[in-house]
Interface confidence: medium
């Protein structure tokens, strides 16, 4: 079995998480991809997904989450803007490949969001303010209505690097919903 590893991001409220998930180019370029949160003892919850088939370099925005799939480079870019403390948690990228269960991309992201603005460790201040300009070409995509029961149902033990975070609910709604968070102008 592949060892589940995590990479930790410590960011301040209002900043932007900006990560990439690499995938096998030939196999998954046009497959639909999703960004999920994993809570202890629960099924992974899909927060946003690309279109089906996934379009090249075409931003998809779901609330505060923006996905961009770069087919030529075999990577999915995920941005979570205007971060809130409640966004803290464990996240992962997956590739939908029905009827098979979703394919998880390594590594998982352990996000820790703390109060108070700081210019680091995210991007420069101009791109981490509370208002984030979204390209006008962004679209929304409906995510599949299933989560495989055989996907990991419990988060792995936290790595020694982790900072414990409260188990408060993240205001991002349920697994199959389009996230109802205001879109910034």
């Amino acid at each position: 079995a592949t060892k589940l590893t995590e990479e930790k991001y410590e960011l301040k409220e209002g900043q932007t998480l900006d990560v990439k998930c690499d995938y096998t180019l030939e196999k998954f370029a046009s497959s639909q991809k999703a960004w999920q949160i994993i809570r202890d003892g629960e099924m992974p919850k899909t927060l946003a997904c690309t279109e089906r088939p996934s379009k090249n370099s075409h931003p998809v925005q779901v609330g505060r989450i923006i996905l961009e799939d770069y087919h030529d480079h075999g990577l999915l870019r995920v941005r979570m803007v205007n971060l809130q403390v409640e966004d803290s948690g464990l996240y992962q990228c997956v590739i939908y490949q029905p009827p098979k269960e979703p394919h998880m991309l390594f590594d998982r992201i352990r996000l820790v969001v703390t109060k108070g603005f700081s210019g680091t460790p995210g991007s420069n201040e101009n791109s981490t303010q509370n208002v984030y300009k979204i390209p006008p070409t962004t679209t929304k995509a409906l995510c599949p209505l299933y989560t495989s029961p055989r996907t990991v149902t419990q988060a792995p033990p936290k790595s020694t690097a982790d900072v414990s975070t409260p188990d408060s609910e993240i205001n991002l709604t349920n697994v199959t919903d389009i996230i109802r968070v205001p879109v910034f102008n």
Epitope: V19, D22, I109, S123
Partner: antibody
């Protein structure tokens, strides 16, 4: 195999700016982080920040946040580091280096495996 | 910021000796640690990544171990070309801080 070639040595006055370039040849440029690291005389290595050219969003160490600008031009496969409001303490050798691992996160690199030859910046009045 | 503390700061040894350099992080960094060798006038060279993985092309006499906060770099049998300054670097969280370095000199 990627190679990183940096611009030549610079001598600058206090208060001025310097812009160092780092051109990649061979290998992949766009999706790996290009980091900037400096070493002042008699001092250790200091990580300044990094950028993934494809994304264009830089990341800075806090002590440089207000003075450094890291950019990249995919078309010329070149990364740049500009440092403003130069002080004598900024006299150092500046290196660009490529992170070699994929991983999930934006700045994941599992170490810096390819380095430029270094650019000496001297700040003196 | 995560502080990285190396010990010793300098070390004298002879060819053939077994040498160990330690690096301690101010907080847990899992296995997100790299080791570099740096010689005057040259660019640093990556030796070890992910705490214990040997970088391609690096001699097997170099090895790394540890996780969490305590890490070691071991050179099993010193060769003349190994005399240099060694740095650890964490990349668990920003900024990706280096240790202050360990200068390895000929006895």
């Amino acid at each position: 195999q990627v190679q990183l070639v940096q611009s030549g040595a610079e001598v600058k006055r206090p208060g001025s700016s310097v812009k160092v370039s780092c051109k990649a040849s061979g290998g992949t440029f766009s999706i790996y982080v290009i980091s900037w690291v400096r070493q002042a005389p008699g001092q250790g290595l200091e990580w300044m920040g990094g950028i993934i050219p494809l994304f264009g969003t830089p990341n800075y160490a806090q002590q440089f946040q207000d003075r450094v600008t890291i950019t990249a031009d995919e078309s010329t496969r070149t990364a740049y580091m500009e440092l403003n409001s130069l002080k004598s303490e900024d006299t150092a050798v500046y290196y660009c280096a490529r992170g070699h691992g994929p991983g999930s996160s934006h700045y994941s690199y599992y170490g810096l495996d390819v380095w430029g030859q270094g650019t000496t910046v001297t700040v003196s009045s | 910021d995560i502080q990285m503390t190396q010990s010793p700061t300098s070390l004298s040894a002879s060819v053939g000796d077994r040498v160990t350099i330690t690096c301690r992080a101010s907080q847990g960094i899992s296995s997100w640690l790299a080791w570099y060798q740096h010689k005057p006038g040259k660019a640093p060279k990556l030796l070890i990544y992910a705490a214990s993985s040997l970088q391609s092309g690096v001699p097997s006499r170099f090895s790394g171990s540890g996780s969490g906060t305590d890490f070691t770099l071991t050179i099993s049998s010193l060769q003349p070309e190994d005399f240099a300054t060694y740095y650890c670097q964490q990349y668990n969280s920003y900024p990706y801080t280096f240790g202050q370095g360990t200068k390895l000199e000929i006895k």
